[in-house]
Amino acid sequence: SGPVKELVGSVGGAVTFPLKSKVKQVDSIVWTFNTTPLVTIQPEGGTIIVTQNRNRERVDFPDGGYSLKLSKLKKNDSGIYYVGIYSSSLQQPSTQEYVLHVYEHLSKPKVTMGLQSNKNGTCVTNLTCCMEHGEEDVIYTWKALGQGDNQFHDGATLSIAWRSGEKDQALTCMARNPVSNSFSTPVFPQKLCEDAATDLTSLRG
């Protein structure tokens, strides 16, 4: 029994739970998901029983080995998987536990502008990057376009101060999870500040 193996998959993709055994005479192999039986294999007779019929098309054994491949992954496939190898030559079953995290491919992040102040020709505001569908385990970073791969800020919220007359700089937010990354539409501080100022003037008028 080895340490817990952490695996990552993407919605619609596939993941392989690696399993090897040096046991010559394996009587049965039982895979469970969150304590629910998933597959029972008896190598000697070559019988493979998938407990839930809907999972039959998703289960495979690459190269005829013991490793289990699960395809057409869904978000709710995330959880704890456990396998037991049973053999009369073993005093107790050989076991392995896995934790699977299934992530969605990220859509384009959205940038919103927070409360803004404009004093002495300097526009100060917060830009916040977020995912519209509340995807989990997302890391955000901000980059200034045209400056190579250099990120200059970690985190969803970026505070900016733009002085009137300064050269405008396109900014983009990158959202990243373990299976994908996605970029926001570039935003321009000058335009944001000018648009906000125009909106403020029209409100006062």
Epitope: K22, K24, P43, E44, G46, T47, D63, G64
Partner: antibody, heavy 120, light 107 residues
């Protein structure tokens, strides 16, 4: 990649035993069962038996118990089958074939076969 | 010994057709059946094991189904390179036994 190498042909005199070889490479030889299968010209497939190289445990088709002897040499990753007292009935192509892990009696890799001709 | 009966000795088909080969076991083998393809002068090639599991790299036009005593092997959208002899084999118990084979030919 997995390979099972067998000599192409063997000419045998009736009554003189012959030892066929099957050299395995590209995988852990002692982990998988090795099978031997007979195919007479224009005929189907007939399972002779299987041997596990780790401890030489053998399972033989009773039809071949007095005909075939299965052995292995772990040091050279080679499986052998000896045919005793060959007759014309033993003229056939003999394949070695590796078992899968998940279904230990299904065979995923096959040698090219050795054509045995028993003739005086 | 378990007898595997492939009733069709040969079958004629055309490219693009769907063809099914049947195999009957003389006793219950649960899902312990494999299917092999053998082309002239070549070794058999494993296509399906445990009745319905496609071996790695086998095109998905090849499918297997069945349990107990009745098994079916299907090729959908037959290609010219599929013309061969197909054997079923029970891998449920020893001695392992094969069907007599079904030769797939072009019409």
């Amino acid at each position: 990649q997995v390979q099972l190498q067998q000599p192409g042909a063997e000419l045998v005199r009736p009554g003189a035993s012959v030892k066929l070889s099957c050299k395995a490479s590209g995988y852990s030889f002692t982990t998988y069962w090795m099978n031997w299968v007979k195919q007479r010209p224009g005929q189907g497939l007939e399972w002779i038996g299987m041997i596990h190289p780790s401890d030489s445990e053998t399972r033989l088709n009773q039809k071949f118990k007095d005909k075939a002897t299965l052995t292995v040499d772990k040091s050279s990753s080679t499986a052998y089958m000896q045919l005793s007292s060959p007759t014309s009935e033993d003229s056939a192509v003999y394949y070695c074939a590796r078992s899968t892990m998940i279904a230990t009696r299904a065979m995923d890799y096959w040698g090219q076969g050795t054509s045995v001709t028993v003739s005086s | 010994d378990i007898v595997m009966t492939q009733s069709q000795k040969s079958m004629s088909t055309s490219v693009g057709d769907r063809v099914s080969i049947t195999c009957k076991a003389s006793q219950d083998v649960i899902t312990g059946v494999a299917w092999y393809q053998q082309k002239p002068g070549q070794s058999p090639k494993l296509l399906i094991y445990s009745a319905s599991y496609r071996y790695t790299g086998v095109p998905d036009r090849f499918t297997g189904s069945g349990s107990g005593t009745d098994f079916t092997f299907t090729i959908s959208n037959v290609q010219a390179e599929d013309l061969a002899v197909y054997y079923c084999q029970q891998h449920y118990s020893t001695p392992l036994t094969f069907g007599a084979g079904t030769k797939l030919e072009l019409k």
